[in-house]
């Protein structure tokens, strides 16, 4: 999937299995990624996890799933709220659009995440204060933390790379360079730019994660997905100017943040 | 799991997570650190070598080291100590949530808190 | 719930060939190394191999190598034992474990080499 | 190939008392950096094996904590602080410094 970091770092990640997105004293994030084609070394977001950690009078712990084509209101427990804690409308579950949409707030901790099902996968969307995301304590159980340091060197895509080499072309062409080799012949470069530009006009990385995108599946709800991110970057995002990136970020690994 | 890479990895971000990126300057303490790191999943090889979670340390401290110039001998470094406040603490700090009244947005005595965003889409 | 499932035991002449499988659920599975372990009727357990996340490394025991070979299917979530050239020996309850420390086992499947 | 011992092969133990099992490598399992990979796993009648312990004395989430582990180089031990019915089983000590890995031959505890 494309991450964007707490530092606003943009990069395209093959990581496949369960990885831990955000993990402090407060919160937990997990995602499961799965191969959007089988060969390709291009993953999406199939399986989501949140616990939100017990708190003082406001909060008992709670966890949050979604799967694929299971986007549920309620925590595993049924609850929409935070439990029995005389705070406990300080944690909330929203639903949107159902099936689609979904937003957890969590007031007592100044947290907004917003889960989506775009297609057949998952987005996920987080703004939270810093000093949350610096709340950690027990420095072992941090694992490969990807909002805050992003993903490791070697499991990340250089899908402007691949941008560039495609254009003109259809997807086949490029297969040696593409992340997915069943990538299919039905989607040129020109229909998967005109795709995207009708809902992402500004050619940022969000449209170029569209274009990857479509030219790597020849799944348009990628195009939704794009879309929806940087819907809930602007909703999110507390800085206005940067909703808009331009220069992905190839990083180090553990140096994202 | 019987497999502690993650410790390893946690070890290491954590000797390293004084700044956002190592300046030029750093490169001798950054290194210093990549070896620990390096030396924590040799230990942990034995255990862990046929898991993904090992590789990935293993390829992503090779790369490291190259990017950085690192030699593979030399000093190892001790991973900083960390003293935020636990969840759990019942007193109020300038440092923790706001805990005393949870309906409350996260607003301390005024204070706007630095916001942060990171998200997740697509392939 | 860590699950997996052995399946593809049964009775072989020595000789012949047989192909086991193990079914993992509960856990990603193309996170993992995976171990074959065997044991004879009333005796005690004997590692037979192991293979890496990625199927990269495969090791052996002195007594399978060259006879047995381990692979598996990440997009089945699916562990794989070909024994061939089958011995009165190698008759065994085979099991499979999760990790390279096998933290995890199946149930195991009965492979009996008789004529 | 490594050879580990146990010792005894069968060990009659009395509900509520310790009990003790011997695992003896025939090279050292220790690392040049100090660490030791021999692990513990029980076999109970009519089950598959599950792993106790792991290198050398660090219990496996869902152990009690009446099962400890100890030693160094060849000689290591697994204890049981007070046998209870449920502990019936056999007990493998398994080395995975050197390849191949091997078991030892097991020691069976059964309840006098």
């Known amino acids: 999937p494309h991450l964007r970091t707490f530092t606003d770092r943009f990069q395209t990640c093959k990581v496949q299995g369960a990885w831990p997105l955000i993990d402090n004293n407060y919160l937990n994030v997990q995602v499961t990624n799965t191969p959007v084609l089988p060969g390709s070394a291009a993953t999406a977001t199939s399986k989501l996890t949140i616990i939100f950690k017990n708190f003082q009078e406001c909060v008992d712990q709670k966890v949050y799933q979604a799967e694929m084509d299971e986007l549920p209101a309620a925590f595993v427990d049924g609850s929409k709220n935070g439990g029995d804690k005389h705070g406990a409308n300080s944690l909330k579950i929203t639903e949107k659009v159902s099936g689609q949409h979904v937003e957890i707030r969590a007031k007592y901790i100044g947290t907004t995440i917003v889960v989506r099902q775009v297609g057949r996968y998952l987005t996920f969307a987080v703004r939270v204060p810093e000093e949350v995301v610096n709340a950690v304590e027990d420095w072992d159980s941090q694992g490969l933390y990807l909002c805050l340091r992003g993903c490791p060197l070697n499991q990340q895509i250089d899908f402007q790379a691949f941008h560039t080499n495609t254009e003109g072309t259809g997807a086949r062409r490029l297969a040696a360079a593409s992340p997915a080799p069943t990538a299919p012949e039905t989607f040129p470069y020109e229909t998967a730019v005109a795709k995207c530009k009708e809902k992402l006009p500004v050619e940022d990385l969000y449209y170029q994660a569209c274009v990857f995108d479509l030219l790597t599946t020849g799944d348009v709800n990628f195009t939704l997905a794009a879309y929806y991110a940087l819907e809930d970057v602007k909703m999110l995002h507390s800085n206005k100017d940067k909703l808009h990136l331009y220069e992905r970020t190839r990083d180090l690994p553990g140096r994202a943040a | 799991s019987p497999c502690k890479i993650l410790k390893c990895n946690s070890e290491f971000w954590s000797a390293t997570s004084g700044s956002h990126a190592p300046a030029s300057d750093d490169t001798p303490e950054f290194c210093a650190a990549l070896r620990s790191y390096a030396l924590c999943t040799r230990r942990t090889a034995r255990t862990c070598r046929g898991d993904l979670a090992y590789h990935s340390a293993v390829h992503g401290i090779e790369d490291l080291m190259s990017q950085h110039n690192c030699s593979k001998d030399g000093p190892t470094s001790q991973p900083r100590l960390h003293t935020l406040p636990p969840a759990g603490d019942s007193q109020e700090r300038s440092d923790s949530p706001e805990i005393c009244h949870c309906e409350k947005s996260f607003h301390k005595h005024s204070a706007t808190p630095n916001y942060t965003h990171c998200g997740l889409f697509g392939d | 719930e860590v699950q997996l499932v052995e399946s593809g035991g049964g009775l072989v002449q020595p000789g012949g060939s047989l192909r086991l499988s193990c079914a993992a659920s509960g856990f990603t599975f193309s996170n993992y190394g995976m171990n074959w372990v065997r044991q004879a009727p009333g005796k005690g357990l004997e590692w037979i191999g192991m293979i890496y996340y990625d199927s990269s490394e495969k090791h052996y025991a002195d007594s399978v190598k060259g006879r047995f070979t381990i692979s598996r299917d990440n997009s089945k979530n699916t562990l794989y034992l070909q024994m061939n050239s089958l011995r009165a020996e190698d008759t065994a309850v085979y099991y499979c474990?999760?990790?390279?420390?096998?933290?995890?086992w199946g149930q195991g499947t009965m492979v009996t080499v008789s004529s | 190939d490594v050879v580990l011992t146990q010792s005894p092969l069968s060990l009659p133990v009395t509900l509520g008392q310790p009990a003790s099992i011997s695992c003896r490598s025939s090279?050292?399992?220790?690392?040049?950096?100090?660490?030791?990979?021999l692990h513990w796993f029980q076999q109970r009648p009519g089950q598959s094996p599950r792993l106790l312990i792991y290198e050398v004395s660090t219990r496996f989430s869902g152990v009690p904590d009446r099962f400890s582990g100890s030693g160094s180089g060849t000689d290591f031990t697994l204890k049981i602080s007070r046998v209870e019915a449920e502990d019936v089983g056999v007990y493998y000590c398994?080395?995975?410094?050197?390849?191949?890995?091997?078991f030892g031959q097991g020691t069976k505890l059964e309840i006098k």
């Open positions: 398994f080395q995975a410094t050197h390849d191949p890995l091997t």
């Open positions: 474990a999760k990790g390279t420390t096998p933290d995890y």
């Open positions: 090279q050292s399992l220790e690392e040049s950096d100090g660490y030791t990979f």
